[in-house]
């Protein structure tokens, strides 16, 4: 009896694992084995596929074959008993294109109101993703074990910290990887659960802000208790993207070590141009808080996000405000090469009732003013980038009197 060729061959590639599955054509024939050959692009000859010779099952693994994952490959299979079937050719494919991203490895650490998530590629030193290691981003789904209400967090890197959680509560999460450059979305990791700890005696510092004064950065934060000491650390933001590396070498800011106030001042030259993460910790001598939320700090934006400079043209019922580039020391204007929005606050000099205008334009009209009345104006700039949500400090207030009633034209 002639053996029939196997049918419906499927190639599954997850990370560096190459799996072949197929259907027997004739279930009634026993003791049949199966063998594969492969052929690379531009070659005429077929080569035996190691790991997939004389297989008795309908599945084989050819991960040991060192292939160029960007090169097209063709496979063929036949059944063997005393005689052999004809070859069945599988559609040619490129391993990289066909490959799926496997589930990442997840390592969790708990605090009282936060969870630190460390994510690593599922296959260490993967050949498939060797050129894409730094391009991986991850997304996760997290939920309270008791409620099951899911929250999704997109576009995170190999280290991510989730804040504002409840103490002594079990949270569960699953993570998947994505290679957006190749339009690939991976499969989810198994579910990992961790319980946050009892509430810490000392809360972490909050509301950390960086501003610029002269040639210095001023770092400020809020704290619940008095008589504390604080320390501040920084880390290059890009280090969060380093796959497989989970040793984060946070560095002290020398002028912000063991400070007794809720602010510290340090020279701008402490940081080269770049994006950094900053965090603050409190201590009362016996106990230490967990670290604060990490804030993103971009020296480019921070250094140049100075309060706007403006001129006022006074009319009887309005001010025309012309916003110019802020001046550096030396009176040279600062070039702002990112979009800004301006917040303008004005009030009658004799009153505390402030009104606010938000504008993208650099010429702004403040309407509905009373003639011959002194109004004061201050302004600040905000970046329009949500991720780098930065604001300058307010400019000094400028006060002007509106003109008499007939000058509005």
């Amino acid at each position: 009896k002639n053996l029939k060729s196997p049918q419906k061959v499927e190639v599954d590639i997850i990370d560096d694992n190459f799996i072949l599955r197929w259907n027997r054509s004739d279930e009634s024939v026993g003791n049949v084995t199966f063998s594969f050959d492969y052929q690379k692009t531009g070659m005429d000859n077929w080569i035996k596929l190691s790991g997939c010779q004389n297989i008795t099952s309908t599945k084989c693994n050819f991960s040991s074959l060192k292939l160029n994952v960007y090169e097209e490959i063709k496979l063929r299979i036949r059944a063997e008993k005393e005689n052999t079937s004809s070859w069945y050719e599988v559609d040619s494919f490129t391993p990289f294109r066909k490959a799926q991203i496997g589930p990442p490895e997840v390592h969790l650490e708990a605090e009282d109101k936060a969870i630190v998530i460390h994510i690593s590629p599922g296959t260490k030193d993967s050949v498939m993703w060797a050129l894409d290691g730094l391009s991986f981003t991850y997304s996760l789904v997290i939920w309270k074990n008791s409620s099951g209400v899911e929250e999704r967090i997109e576009n995170i890197y190999s280290r991510h910290k989730i804040y504002k959680l409840s103490p002594e509560t079990t949270y569960c999460l699953k993570v998947k990887a994505a290679l957006l450059t190749s339009w690939k979305i991976g499969v989810y990791s198994p579910v990992h659960c961790i319980k946050t700890t009892v509430e810490n005696e000392l809360p972490p510092p909050e509301n950390i802000e960086v501003s610029v004064q002269n040639q210095n950065y001023v770092l400020k934060w809020d704290y619940t208790y008095a008589n504390m000491t604080f320390q501040v650390q920084w880390l290059h933001a890009f280090l969060k993207r380093n796959p497989g590396n989970h040793l984060y070498k946070w560095k002290q800011i020398p002028d912000c070590e063991n400070v007794k106030t809720t602010q510290c001042v340090f020279p701008q030259n402490v940081f080269q141009k770049g994006i950094y993460l900053l965090r603050v910790q409190a201590s009362d001598g016996n106990n230490t808080s967990f670290w604060s939320e990490e804030i993103k700090f971009d020296t480019e934006i921070q250094a140049f996000l100075l309060p706007p400079v403006f001129n006022i043209r006074s009319l009887s019922d309005s001010f025309h405000i012309y916003i110019g580039a802020p001046k550096q020391s030396g009176n040279t204007p600062v070039i702002q090469d990112y979009p800004l929005i301006y917040e303008i606050i004005f009030w009658e000099n004799t009153s505390n009732a402030e009104r606010k205008i938000i504008e993208k334009k650099t010429d702004v009209t403040v309407p509905n003013l009373k003639p011959l009345t002194v109004y004061c104006v201050k302004a600040r700039a905000h970046t329009m980038d949500e991720k780098l949500n930065k604001s300058s400090v307010f400019s000094d207030a400028v006060c002007e009197k509106t003109k008499p009633g007939n000058t509005s034209k």
Epitope: E109, E111, H118, E201, L247, N286, T288
Partner: antibody, heavy 118, light 107 residues
């Protein structure tokens, strides 16, 4: 494979100094921390301090601050511990350890016995 | 400094027994605790890190749990090669501190 090889045993007089070495292989010392830990005879473990060989930043336990100096030479992948003004209670085995992922001291040297005796 | 109080200091047990070693931190250290095994004349060896993660190659009879201030190392069925001293260590804050050790002896 990762290995940490420490210098040999030392017998020193009270008041003197000693410098111990720890040579790493199988990894890039700059990518890790290098720690030193003390274990007195029949006692527990005491963390002395650590260095980041990449920029020589150090941290010390308050007890050892001032008497211990940790340095590193990245060109030879070696970390050093210098102990000064030695006294009898400094007699101990001193271990170096690599600080790796998640801040874990994941690989340890074989230890160096320092005996302080007149 | 954070104190790590380990108990018991000594533990006499037989092969096949289940053993529990506890460690109490003087303040909340999250899950930043490591467990080591040390045999006489040898260097310490990491068993468990981040409170509950077993190092690859460590037998599954070793497990760790706990968070905040209370941590536990369990050996589900003691084997002859497990007779050694066990230390806990916190890695939440400098200076790193160790428990005083638990010596596991054959009964």
């Amino acid at each position: 494979q990762v290995q940490l090889v420490q210098s040999g045993a030392e017998v020193v007089k009270p008041g003197a100094s000693v410098k111990l070495s720890c040579k790493g292989s199988g990894f890039n010392i700059k990518d890790y921390y290098m720690h030193w830990v003390k274990q007195a005879p029949g006692q527990g473990l005491e963390w002395i301090g650590r260095i980041d060989p990449e920029d020589a930043e150090t941290k010390y336990a308050p007890k050892f601050q001032g008497r211990a100096t940790i340095t590193a030479d990245t060109s030879t992948s070696t970390a050093y511990l210098e102990l000064s003004s030695l006294r009898s209670e400094d007699t101990a085995v001193y271990y170096c350890a690599r600080g790796g992922n998640f801040y874990v001291m994941d690989y340890w040297g074989q230890g160096t016995l320092v005996t302080v005796s007149s | 400094d954070i104190q790590m109080t380990q108990s018991p200091s000594f533990l006499s047990t037989s092969v096949g027994d289940r053993v529990t070693v506890t460690c109490k931190a003087s303040q909340n250290v999250g899950t930043n605790v490591v467990w080591y095994q040390q045999k006489p004349g040898k260097s310490p060896k990491v068993l468990i890190y981040s409170a509950s993660y077993r190092v690859s190659g460590v037998p599954s009879r070793f497990s760790g749990s706990g968070s905040g201030t209370e941590f536990t190392l369990i050996i589900s069925s003691v084997q002859p090669e497990d007779f050694a001293t066990y230390f806990c260590q916190q890695k939440n804050n400098y200076p790193y501190t160790f428990g005083q050790g638990t010596k596991l002896e054959i009964k």
